[in-house]
Amino acid sequence: YDFTNCDFEKIKAAYLSTISKDLITYMSGTKSTEFNNTVSCSNRPHCLTEIQSLTFNPTAGCASLAKEMFAMKTKAALAIWCPGYSETQINATQAMKKRRKRKVTTNKCLEQVSQLQGLWRRFNRPLLKQQ
């Protein structure tokens, strides 16, 4: 999906009002400097691409983020403020339902969410280029 035509300010507002708190809640108990920042993004569409990938694509050691509160709110924000996004996700959602797993917070998931916090932080930068 090409995130170029999203309403970035509305997504930013959704992040600041709710998603950020849900990320904080998920990370509760984690040490500030426990994880290095290794994932980056250069502009807002790129940040959303990386955020979508880390939030919804299962990775080795962390298959369970898509059902977390911050993930569901991220999905809702993208569906509302990115034209055509929800249509591209129908197939992916159906595939995800088939492999639904028990929610387990692993260290790998915490590291992934730490990277997500960094990506969202970059997305919110006022001077970040949109293109």
């Epitope: 950020s20 708190k21 809640t25 509760s28 040490k31 500030s32 400097t33 426990e34 970059r122």
Partner: antibody
Amino acid sequence: QVQLVQSGAEVKKPGASVKVSCKASGYTFTSYLMHWVRQAPGQRLEWMGEIDPSDSYTDYNQNFRGRVTITVDMSASTAYMELSSLRSEDTAVYYCALTGTINYFDYWGQGTLVTVSS
Amino acid sequence: DIQMTQSPSFLSASVGDRVTITCKASQDVVTAVAWYQQKPGKAPKLLIYWASMRHTGVPSRFSGSGSGTEFTLTISSLQPEDFATYFCQQYSSFTFTFGQGTKLEIK
């Protein structure tokens, strides 16, 4: 182990600028955010701003916008905080402090006293 | 910005006493609160993060609790080295803000 070592005390006249340094060691400099926090005599701690050394992006407390500039020298693993248009109320101890993506401060510099006096 | 209001500002107590310091946030900060100890001429030292988690090396007599808008730091049995100033800080929301401090003095 992580260490943050700051430059020495400064005395400045009103209207002048001051530049405080913070040399980091014991970790990969680009991995974490560097913040500056100040404490005026008998006052609460006040967050001034932060820099991401990986790309030098800064965020500032609006109370200081326009007067504070935070920079890094990657080759020296050193962060700098410059405060301009100094006034007597800027007399304070200035600290550098380190965080990851979660913004509480588990590592601090020893502090630099800046005195603004005519 | 979220305001953090600490009480009391001053507290006199004796070695062995149990003391509690309170911090109230002007809006919900979940559990994103840290507590610091500061001695004269020194940098603050992290005691508690995530409202209730003790930092490495912090004695078990220090404990934190709370969520939402009300938080407490408790020292179960004061030791001579505990007389200092204590600050709370919220990191739920940009800009990060601190309480005004509680100075703990020997009675």
